[in-house]
């Protein structure tokens, strides 16, 4: 009996035309939502003039439906048993699941000012930037609508730069009508234990953002894992959002709509400093902001973002060192709301429910040559927003799963 089930599972989780896995893999049957909470800055003037702590108040959720588009350019390679694809990006605003509209205004850090002053550290260039910042009446903070902040706006300061630069700025710009990839993953035909594991991303086995093992593309994309998952496993996956591979460990047994699943969570150790977790040494890319690699809980992904000083963390700086959150008032981290988890059906390896949570922050530093940053006395890793991307298997799919998979085993 068990052997027959194993054989059936092995057959059905292969990523090729005609299998259950393939159908759900090409276009997810699960509704996936991305909720955003924006950190609205309450005291912009005091910060700019006196280098005060930044007081933030989160506003949200603002919800978008995402991952509703089928994978594109799906191409099987029989020679190396891989399948390659592009994952198109799309986001549709869901007013009924949101606290307001895309036209809601927020006071946030001026993304262009913070980024330009970081990218161009030469004093002369900063003096040029300063004159353009002043001319465009830009400041350290700005008021932007949700739509502008997420999907892009024409920046008045960058529009004055007299040589070719991208003048449109947005945390997720460009997004709609773009695609992530090309991913090339093992289809599992020759070896089911490799199914969905990424072979290459954008044609490479490495990212070129990090040193040593940190640069590797490990595991799957977290939508599924090879079948017959054990609680003792460490599940590796790659997330292009955070420009790195990461891992999850077993936390608890969960019953999801009558289906027994394993809850795997991202442990605090994954965000630890190299002092506590030596494996993380290669995620520490500079010595000043990281206080000689002793800070933890924030990841500098500037190399992956054309030099823009983007730092990724968990929401509200969960699992981050006190020095990171010290200059920010109004944060309340808690595990239940702010950690990432994956609920995996162990027989198939399918992720039936997940909550991916992350926070986007921007570094802003004092600059003697940029007037609006002149009075800062310290560096700030400024939270801009946090997001919660969730998906849960639908009732119909759950019934089908129970009858065809778990029911047959039990």
């Amino acid at each position: 009996g068990d052997l027959l089930i194993q054989k059936t599972i092995k057959k059905q989780v292969v990523l090729e035309e005609g299998t259950i896995a393939f159908k759900n893999w090409v276009k997810t049957g699960t509704e996936v939502y991305r909720q955003f909470w924006i950190f609205d800055v309450q005291n912009p003037q005091e910060v700019m003039m006196n280098s005060s702590n930044i007081q933030v108040k989160q506003r949200g959720p603002y919800t978008y439906r995402v991952r509703f588009l089928a994978k594109e350019n799906v191409t099987q390679d029989a020679e190396d048993n891989t399948v390659s694809f592009l994952q198109p990006n799309g986001a549709i605003f869901e007013p009924s699941l949101s606290v307001g509209t895309e036209a809601d205004n927020f006071t946030v850090l001026n993304l262009a000012v913070a980024a330009a002053s970081h990218i161009y550290q030469n004093q002369f260039v900063q003096m040029i930037l300063n004159s353009l910042i002043n001319k465009s009446k830009s400041s350290m903070f700005q008021v932007r609508t949700l739509r502008e902040l997420l999907w892009g706006y024409r920046d008045p300061f960058l529009s004055l730069v007299p040589y070719p630069v991208t003048t449109t700025v947005g945390l997720f710009y460009p997004y709609n009508n773009t695609a992530d990839g090309v991913y090339k993953v093992f289809n599992g035909k020759d070896n089911i234990s490799k199914v969905a594991i990424i072979d290459t991303y954008k044609g490479k086995r490495n990212l070129s953002y990090w040193e040593s093992h940190c640069d590797m593309i490990n595991g799957t994309d977290a939508a599924s894992f090879p079948p017959f998952v054990e609680k003792s496993q460490v599940l590796q996956f790659f997330s292009s959002d955070i420009c790195r591979s990461i891992y999850a460990v077993f936390e608890s047994d969960v019953n999801l709509k009558g289906i027994p699943v394993y809850r795997f969570v991202l442990p605090s150790k994954a965000f630890a400093s190299p002092v506590e977790n030596p494996d993380n040494y290669c995620f520490c890319t500079e010595k000043i902001i990281s206080k000689n690699c002793t800070s933890y809980g924030v990841l500098d992904i500037s190399k992956c973002k054309e030099g823009r000083p983007v730092y990724i963390s968990l929401p509200h700086f969960l699992y981050a060192s006190p020095d990171v959150s010290e200059p920010i008032d109004g944060l309340n981290p808690n595990e239940e709301e702010h950690r990432t988890y994956l609920d995996i059906e162990p027989i198939t390896g399918f992720t039936l429910q997940f909550a991916k949570r992350l926070q986007v922050n921007l570094l802003v530093k004092p600059s003697e040559k940029i007037q609006v940053l002149k009075n800062l006395k310290r560096n700030y890793i400024v939270p801009i927003l946090w997001l919660n991307e969730t998906g849960t298997i639908g009732d119909e799919k759950a019934n089908m799963f129970r009858s065809q998979v778990t029911g047959k085993i039990n």
């Epitope: 002369f124 003096m127 040029i128 004159s131 003697e368």
Partner: antibody, heavy 118, light 107 residues
């Protein structure tokens, strides 16, 4: 040792233009900005402007906007200043000067004498 | 524009004497000030940057001080090769501006 080699003296007619060069040696040309300074007995030293070859950024003294144009050729590590619609007022010694990571105007070229005369 | 007023415009001093030249800015320039020496027919030579930092290779008898609007260059013990014209420059904001110069001659 960093060196700045400027082009030779120029005798030019009023109304014409002149393009002076400053070749940079022994450092990474795109890292630091090059400034141009005009010197006359009447006005002393005057900053014309500067260019950062790495970013393409330029800054000008308003007094010289429309009069002087700064460019840089990364392939030959050479900075240029073009002075147009020349009058006797433009007769001067023109210096290029390099700013390094530590000091502004740390190195100077030998200067180019421009004489505007009929 | 920031105006740099240098004084004296010229001075005579003896060898071994302590010499001080001053430069006053029309506004606070945050110590973004350099000092240059120029000899006849030669290009300027940078001595001091950031108000008080000595450029490599410059003799230690030269020193700079000051903050805000007021700055000075001091030669602790004058030597023959120190004769020439001394200029200050502010690079706090555009346009960068030079002082009119101080001509130092042997008494």
């Amino acid at each position: 040792q960093v060196q700045l080699q400027q082009s030779g003296a120029e005798l030019v007619r009023p109304g014409a233009s002149v393009k002076l060069s400053c070749k940079a040696l022994n450092y990474t040309f795109t890292d630091y900005e090059m400034h141009w300074v005009k010197q006359t007995p009447v006005h002393g030293l005057e900053w014309i402007g500067g260019i950062h070859p790495g970013s393409g950024g330029t800054a000008y003294n308003q007094r010289f906007k429309g009069k002087a144009t700064l460019t840089a050729d990364k392939s030959s590590s050479t900075a240029y200043i073009e002075v147009s619609s020349l009058t006797s007022e433009d007769s001067a010694v023109y210096y290029c000067s390099l700013t390094t990571a530590s000091a502004w105007f740390a190195y100077w070229g030998q200067g180019t004498l421009v004489t505007v005369s009929v | 524009d920031i105006k740099m007023t240098q004084s004296p415009s010229s001075m005579y001093a003896s060898l071994g004497e302590r010499v001080t030249i001053t430069c006053k800015a029309s506004q606070d320039i945050n110590s973004y000030l350099s000092w240059f020496q120029q000899k006849p027919g030669k290009s300027p030579k940078t001595l001091i940057y950031r108000a008080n930092r000595l450029l490599d290779g410059v003799p230690s008898r030269f020193s700079g001080s000051g903050s805000g609007q007021d700055y000075s260059l001091t030669i602790s013990s004058l030597e023959y090769e120190d004769m020439g014209i001394y200029y200050c420059l502010q690079y706090d904001e555009f346009p960068l501006t030079f002082g009119a110069g101080t001509k130092l001659e042997l008494k």
